[in-house]
């Protein structure tokens, strides 16, 4: 298992919510991506393939997510101070070999300007 800080902008704020970006290498064909808050699994997305390049997406712990050819974005809404924590992208690579697990993460700071419903 490889652990490290994300070397890209992991948190993108908009409209009182946050998009958490979890990247994976372009060559990865089948994988599981989990979003961890501390040690707790918040979100889970698995991409598998079949013959003829048919793709299947499985989400056990459902979060609003978006898949591209090199990243999974998980969206958290209605931010408040309780969302401040360490978040980790836990990537399990099934295909191509060898099987590998990588963990990258960062701390989500919550500032007043990013909250959804500020009191004026």
């Amino acid at each position: 298992e490889i652990n490290g800080s994300a070397n890209y902008e992991m948190f993108i704020f908009h409209n009182g919510g946050v998009q958490i970006l979890c990247k994976y290498p372009d060559i990865v064909q089948q994988f599981k991506m989990q979003l961890l808050k501390g040690g707790q699994i918040l979100c889970d997305l698995t991409k598998t393939k079949g013959s003829g390049n048919t793709v299947s997406i499985k989400s056990l712990k459902f979060c609003h997510s978006q898949l591209s050819n090199n990243s999974v974005s998980f969206f958290l809404y209605n931010l408040d101070h309780s969302h401040a924590n360490y978040y980790f992208c836990n990537l399990s690579i099934f295909d191509p070999p060898p099987f590998k697990v990588t963990l990258t993460g960062g701390y989500l700071h919550i500032y007043e300007s990013q909250l959804c419903c500020q009191l004026k």
Epitope: Q29, Q30, K32, T46, T48, K49, G50, S51, T54, S56, K58, S92, F94, D95, P96, P97, P98, F99
Partner: antibody
Framework: EVQLVESGGGVVRPGGSLRLSCAAS????????MSWVRQVPGKGLEWVSG????????DYADSVKGRFTISRDNAKNSLYLQMNSLRAEDTALYYC?????????????????WGQGTLVTVSS | EIVLTQSPGTLSLSPGERATLSCRAS???????LAWYQQKPGQAPRLLIY???SRATGIPDRFSGSGSGTDFTLTIRRLEPEDFAVYYC????????FGPGTKVDIK
Amino acid sequence: EVQLVESGGGVVRPGGSLRLSCAASGLTFDDYGMSWVRQVPGKGLEWVSGINWNGDNTDYADSVKGRFTISRDNAKNSLYLQMNSLRAEDTALYYCARDYYGSGSYYNVPFDYWGQGTLVTVSS
Amino acid sequence: EIVLTQSPGTLSLSPGERATLSCRASQSVSSSYLAWYQQKPGQAPRLLIYGASSRATGIPDRFSGSGSGTDFTLTIRRLEPEDFAVYYCQQYGSSPFFGPGTKVDIK
């Protein structure tokens, strides 16, 4: 403890049908892609068919395409193989096997746990 | 389809000796989608190696795999009595295909 138990084998005449079952326990069944692999007693192994975690993706060896159908019932932790138009060359021990990673895929994955097999004999 | 050839067909060795089993593919096995299985009489196959060189869970380190492209090797460093069995290589990229097997028996 992970267990895969095949059943449904038997003796059938050429042109006949059989439905094999594989009952899984000790695992979260829908985390796994599954495959059927067969072996003529005393001979080598032949992959027959595979299915992904929810049945969306399936594939077959050319030798059984159009005659065999793989399916699964995750609520019952069960895998099936419907075999129609059976031929003498389908005689073999049929194993079910799960994907090693728990990826939910049968595709581009090795197999770790296997059942003990169920014997299919096609003979007139 | 990729055809696998295994050699030798039978390998007669004594406990403690080193076993070297070969698997050759008719065309390149992409991304090392190659596995090795062990099968003993009356038992189901057991996964030893996947990705050409990664040991499966619980497999002793006397088993090792190597190779890429079309030529792959399974090495058993020191044969234990329980290692005498038939060994199959398998390419599992796209439609899986198994080799014919190598029998390792006691000399």
